[in-house]
Structures are given as C-alpha cells and as structure tokens.
C-alpha cells in the first residue's frame, strides 16, 4: 500500500520540499501533539457492560515501542445484576494506527512504516440471528 | 535508551534510540492480515451503545480519511429496544499515529502526528456520588 501523492491540482509542490531518494520518503518521528494527554474517562473499562483489561506490548524495534491492547474480560455482557448475560456478546472495537519498524539487515538498518490493529475497548452487541424462512 | 541486539561485527556508531529523522520505504506493511473487517463493520448498529460514523478528511494527512464515532444516545439500548437512561453510552477514545505532510504539500516528506479519535461507544454504569 503506497502513500498517495498529493492529488489536488491546487497543491503545487513547494520549492522548500526536501530532496528524497526514489521509492522512499523522509519521516520526522518527533511527534506533533506528543504531550497531548487523553483524559482517561474514569475507568470506563471496568464500568462497561462489556469490560476489558489492558496489556502492554513492548518491542524495542518498533516506534513507539509501547502499544497498549485491550482484551474483553468476558464472552457475554454484564447485566444490571452484575451477572454475565450470555445472550449478548462482548466484542472488541479495533482501530488501525501507524508505527515505524526498524529492521536490521547485516550491519545496515532500514525503516518501514507498518499499520497495526489496536484493540481499543469492547462493546456489547446482539449477535445476528439468521431466521430460517 | 533501548539496547538493540546487533551483529557483533558491525561498527558501533549507531544510536540505540530511534533517530529523529528516518528515510522509510513508501510501501506500508500491513500487519492486519488475520482480521476480518466485515465482521466488525456493523457493530455500530448492533451495539447496546450504538454510534454514528463521521468522515474526517484531510489531504495533508495520511490516512487522509478517518472515521470518528459519535454515540447516538445518552443512554443504552435495553432488551426491549428502548433507551435506558440508567446506563450511559460513552465514547472509547484512542490516540493513533498518522503522517502529516511537512513542509505542507510536500509529496514525500512527513512528520508523525498523534491524534485522538473516538473509535466506538460502550455502555457503562454511571458513577453515583452519594451525598455524605
């Protein structure tokens, strides 16, 4: 999957664009909004009817090296009585994000952009019931 | 810094941390091969905390299109299909990394940007504050 070129005709390539070798692109990994903090919505992962836990995956050859993944705690959903309702299902909600992968080939190092799927949390759904006609 | 296992025969000049600027291949590797996107494509309708998806487009960003979730109700849908206001639909937010063209409009020069997106909604029990 290639990064699309700027497609709009009103986008003229500015003179200030840095020279880049063919087939690659320049990437500054000093993150914009690095210090933006998510206001953690008061432990919704425990209060949800489809609660989840978090696990941290760590990979020193990935940037960012830490990626947090959610895991649904139950198969069913938690009802008003605090019991698991197995006629409903806790399902993962997923979102793609980009990471930079560092690859060692002999003594040389190359960098590759990667799409990874992060499980963000869980939601409670009714399964599709296919009724026989 | 992070120590990277290296070939012992290599000159030890490379920084163990990621450099500030890197040259990366234009092809993006997709790790998400064993997931079926169709499976989760209609959770937004079948959830007890359903949501609508809003298109956010920005040609200066990759990916240029990001879908933002907005919870449909304040409450959650009960077994009878009605909104139960004893429960709350809340957005699940996630920080993701995207590419921002920098300098602007440049075809092959980017900077990583962290953005906050609402991915979906979940149904929660409200926190009840009891008056002492």
């Amino acid at each position: 999957r290639k990064i699309p070129k700027v497609g709009h005709t009103f986008f003229q390539k500015p003179e200030s664009c840095p020279p880049v070798p063919g087939g690659s692109m320049k990437l500054d990994i000093g993150i914009i909004n690095e210090n933006q903090r998510v206001s953690m919505s008061r432990n919704i992962e425990s209060r949800s009817t489809s609660p989840w836990n978090y696990t941290v995956t760590w990979d020193p050859n990935r940037y960012p090296s830490e990626v947090v993944q959610a895991q649904c705690r139950n198969l069913g959903c938690i009802n008003a009585q605090g019991k698991e309702d197995i006629s409903m299902n806790s399902v993962p909600i997923q979102q793609e994000t980009l990471v930079v992968r560092r690859k060692h080939q002999g003594c040389s190092v190359s960098f590759q952009l990667e799409k990874v799927l992060v499980t963000v949390g869980c939601t409670c759904v009714t399964p599709v019931i296919h009724h026989v006609q | 810094g992070i120590t990277i296992p290296r070939n012992p025969g290599c000159p030890n000049s490379e920084d163990k941390n990621f450099p500030r600027t890197v040259m990366v291949n234009l092809n993006i590797h997709n790790r998400n091969t064993n997931t079926n996107p169709k499976r989760s494509s209609d959770y937004y309708n079948r959830s007890t905390s359903p949501w609508n998806l809003h298109r956010n487009e920005d040609p200066e960003r990759y990916p240029s299109v990001i879908w933002e979730a907005k919870c449909r109700h304040l409450g959650c849908i009960n077994a009878d299909g009605n909104v139960d206001y004893h429960m709350n639909s809340v957005p699940i937010q996630q920080e993701i990394l995207v590419l921002r063209r920098e300098p602007p409009h440049c075809p092959n020069s980017f900077r990583l940007e962290k953005i906050l997106v609402s991915v979906g909604c979940t149904c929660v029990t409200p926190i009840v504050h009891h008056v002492a």
Partner: antibody
Framework: QVQLVQSGAEVKKPGASVKVSCKAS????????MHWVKQSHGQRLEWMGG????????SYNQNFKGKATLTVDTSASTAYMELSSLRSEDTAVYYC????????????????WGQGTTVTVSS | EIVLTQSPDFQSVTPKEKVTITCSAS?????MHWYQQKPDQSPKLLIK???KLASGVPSRFSGSGSGTDFTLTINSLEAEDAATYYC?????????FGQGTKLEIK
C-alpha cells in the same frame, strides 16, 4: 472441514495438575470461541467455560472457577484447558467444542466437538 | 442457573416408530439446542435455535417449543438413531444441558 483434535488420555495423582490441548483446523481459529465441557461417567454434560481467541474474553461456569484455566495459542490454532489440584471427582472425559463467532452466531452456539480426552485421577 | 429436565430418561423403541423427547426448563428460555451422542463418540449438533436442522442432519429430526417447554421429534426411527439425546440452553449463564434421554432400538 472443521476438526478439533484433542491430546491423549491422562492418568494423574490427586493434587497434581493436567493440561489438555485442542488443535483446531478447517476454519479461522481466531474468529470462533472455544468451549470446554466435562462429562463424568454416565453423567450429564457440564459446561466449564469458553474463551474468545480474538478478544481474549473468557467466561467460566462458577463451579469451575479456580479449578479450570482456559488459554489459547493463536499462532498454533490451539486451545488449552488446565485443571489444578486434581481430585477423584475430576475423573471424566473433557471435550473442547467450537462456539459461535459473536457475529453471525452467539459465542455460546456450540457446533463442532473434539473427540474427548479422558482424565483419570487415581492414587 | 436454569435446570433442564428431559423426559423420559430412557426409551426402548422399534424402528419406524415416532419418538418424542421433551425438555422442560426451570425458567423461560429463548432458544433450545439438541445434541446426539452415540456410545464412545462425542456429541453432535442436531438442532439449533429450537427448530433449525444442523447441516447433514436427516429431515426425520425436528424441533419445536417455546418458553419452558421444548420437544425433539424423530419421525420414523432408524437403527442408527440409537444414542443419548441432550437439550441445551444459552439463554442464561451458565450454559446448561439436560440430563440426557437414552434411546434404545428394540
């Protein structure tokens, strides 16, 4: 076709642990839940619990909480059920059984079963 | 938990006979599944969601019922139908099975 192949029979001493495996093939392992069912000699079937390999979600029958632990190795398309602190009443045939996908079917819709693993607890 | 009680526990029948097995739930359930288990074999899904025939199951098997009372019917019994039959519900946690009905062919 869907196949669930379980590990062989086990004979264990009281107090020991046992781990039964269930290798799945013929479908995408991640997309369906895996359940475990106990059948004591001549007794009714008892659902022990189920696990979703994709989300990590687990559901246990209260009677087996602390007794059974369900895990999966998605790279090997294999589910595991470990029984701890074995007692004579744990002697039974244990089945793994494929549940639904939470999408077209409920997670608890059991369709295919493994051949069963006999666990005997004897001093 | 929902207790499922099957009736009868045991039945001895001749081929071509019509057989009815009932399953009574201690409280109302939406759907009932039925499984067949032959000696020294694992259970096999017969009927799901009360009345849907599982793939490869002969049409002589049928299921019906609602609320607390459900029925499995075998229209014209064949020798290969000798087995123990179990009902099962997933309406309420935990998932539970009936005690089983053993069918013997005379």
């Amino acid at each position: 076709q869907v196949q669930l192949v379980q590990s062989g029979a086990e004979v264990k001493k009281p107090g020991a642990s046992v781990k039964v495996s269930c290798k799945a093939s013929g479908y995408t392992f991640n997309e369906y839940t895996m359940h475990w069912v106990k059948q004591s000699h001549g007794q009714r079937l008892e659902w022990m619990g189920g696990i979703n390999p994709n989300s990590g979600g687990v559901s246990y029958n209260q009677n087996f909480k602390g007794k059974a632990t369900l895990t999966v190795d998605t790279s090997a398309s294999t589910a595991y059920m470990e029984l701890s602190s074995l007692r004579s009443e744990d002697t039974a045939v244990y089945y793994c059984a494929r549940g639904g996908d939470g999408y077209y079917t409920n997670y608890f819709d059991i369709d295919y079963w493994g051949q069963g693993t006999t666990v005997t607890v004897s001093s | 938990e929902i207790v499922l009680t099957q009736s009868p526990d045991f039945q001895s029948v001749t081929p071509k006979e019509k057989v009815t097995i009932t399953c009574s739930a201690s409280s109302s359930v939406n759907y009932m599944h039925w499984y067949q288990q032959k000696p020294d074999q694992s259970p096999k899904l017969l009927i799901k969601d009360t009345s849907k025939l599982a793939s490869g199951v002969p049409s002589r098997f049928s299921g019906s019922g609602s609320g607390t009372d459900f029925t499995l019917t075998i229209n014209s019994l064949e020798a290969e139908d000798a087995a123990t039959y179990y009902c099962q519900q997933w309406n309420s946690h935990p998932l539970t099975f009936g005690q089983g009905t053993k069918l013997e062919i005379k």
